[in-house]
């Protein structure tokens, strides 16, 4: 992938819109289709004031851990869906799109150099454990996906891309 493709705002925008659309088709988070078991996902909350002052390396760790857990969560949802009788086709389609989207974003971030931030020297303080929560519906899962892209991922790539422009 071209090194700074993720710095083209249209790229991330496409995935954000796909995630929001997936959330919308699941008929609301209260009454939409349920997951047959709870799935652990990253907590997507961003403390705007503290995030802005985090080292870009710390941001990278949070983004990378979140992306990894989110990918596992959506693969788990895909497996649960495959095991259910007559899974809704639209749901299947959006799960497949999310998996493909997360794979692409992971590759783009790798090219951007986000992964090297995880290789911290042995004497550095280990990163704080990733905050997580559990979801019980497909809507909530897609909502976390949309929030993660719109929040931490967009804030992080924005910062890295800005630095690269200097």
């Amino acid at each position: 992938a071209p090194p700074r493709l993720i710095c083209d705002s249209r790229v991330l925008e496409r995935y954000i819109l796909e995630a929001k659309e997936a959330e919308n088709v699941t008929m609301g988070c209260a009454e939409g289709p349920r997951l047959s078991e709870n799935i652990t996902v990253p907590d997507t909350k961003v403390n705007f004031y503290a995030w802005k002052r985090m080292e870009v390396e710390e941001q990278a760790i949070e983004v990378w851990q979140g992306l990894s857990l989110l990918s596992e969560a959506i693969l788990q949802a895909q497996a649960l869906l495959a095991n259910s009788s007559q899974p809704p086709e639209t749901l299947q389609l959006h799960i497949d799109k999310a998996i493909s989207g997360l794979r692409s974003l992971t590759s783009l971030l790798r090219v951007l150099g986000a992964q090297k931030e995880l290789m911290s020297p042995p004497d550095t303080t280990p990163p704080a454990p990733l905050r997580t929560l559990t979801v019980d519906t497909f809507c909530k899962l897609f909502r976390v996906y949309a929030n993660f892209l719109r929040g931490k991922l967009k804030l992080y790539t924005g910062e890295v891309c800005r630095r690269g422009d200097r």
């Epitope: 925008e13 819109l17 997507t44 909350k45 705007f48 004031y49 929030n147 719109r150 929040g151 924005g158």
Partner: antibody, heavy 123, light 109 residues
Framework: QVQLVQSGAEVKKPGSSVKVSCKAS????????ISWVRQAPGQGLEWMGG????????DYAQKFQGRVTITADESTSTAYMELSSLRSEDTAVYYC????????????????WGRGTLVTVSS | SYVLTQPPSVSVAPGKTARITCSGD??????VHWYQQKPGQAPVLVIY???ERPSGIPERFSGSNSGNTATLTISRVEAGDEADYYC???????????FGGGTKLTVLG
């Protein structure tokens, strides 16, 4: 129930400073950021900046950078907004708003508002 | 800095549906929040995250965000809905909360 009680109206001279307070009750003060928003007569809402009481980090809109200082005193559950070098265009109602993470939001929203403090700048 | 554009005024008859728009570049990529402000009062959050309603806000209030426009829809409009309505987004490129210019909703009759 969350309540934000703001200090009373002020009349100030151009070039002077004003400090508006916002006392919060209900809920844990340090858990929620406080934003300040102003509204000039007959105009819309304008975000000035805010503070995260846990870290003490404040952030300001570009327009007010260097003129506004936002602080928080955890012991009294009070946030403050000080605006210096006042000019007539600063005549406005100044609101504090407490931010809250609603279910499913990645970013806190301005959920609770004070009743506003009218600051009049006049010579 | 990001700009949100709202019509200055919208008029509607009681019992009808009012639609207040808010437009901005690639607005569907943002989460839009809506506030209601009655004369002499502080703003009140009526919709957050495009289409979610805080508790205590009637079901008549709903939101959507697609195309280049976010819309606040108030169905079965009542006289008490007369107010100014503001849309809001967080613009991470400037790290600012941005408000639209506001729309005055007038309930006719």
């Amino acid at each position: 129930q969350v309540q934000l009680v703001q200090s009373g109206a002020e009349v100030k001279k151009p070039g002077s400073s004003v400090k508006v307070s916002c006392k919060a009750s209900g809920g844990t003060f340090r858990s929620y950021a406080i934003s300040w928003v102003r509204q000039a007569p007959g105009q819309g809402l304008e975000w000035m900046g805010g503070i995260d009481p846990i870290s003490g980090f404040a952030d300001y809109a570009q327009k007010f950078q260097g003129r506004v200082t936002i602080t928080a005193d955890e012991s009294t559950s009070t946030a403050y907004m000080e605006l210096s070098s006042l000019r007539s265009e600063d005549t406005a109602v100044y609101y504090c708003a407490r931010e809250l993470y609603y279910p499913g939001t990645w970013m806190a929203v301005m959920a609770y508002w004070g009743r506003g403090t009218l600051v009049t700048v006049s010579s | 800095s990001y700009v949100l554009t709202q019509p200055p005024s919208v008029s509607v008859a009681p019992g009808k549906t009012a639609r207040i728009t808010c437009s901005g570049d690639n607005i569907p990529e943002y989460y839009v929040h809506w506030y209601q402000q009655k004369p002499g009062q502080a703003p009140v959050l009526v919709i957050y995250r495009d289409n979610e309603r805080p508790s205590g806000i009637p079901e008549r209030f709903s939101g959507s965000n697609s195309g280049n426009t976010a819309t606040l829809t108030i169905s079965r409009v009542e006289a008490g809905d007369e107010a100014d309505y503001y849309c809001q987004v967080f613009d991470e490129s400037s790290w600012h909360w941005v408000f639209g210019g506001g729309t005055k909703l007038t309930v006719l009759g």
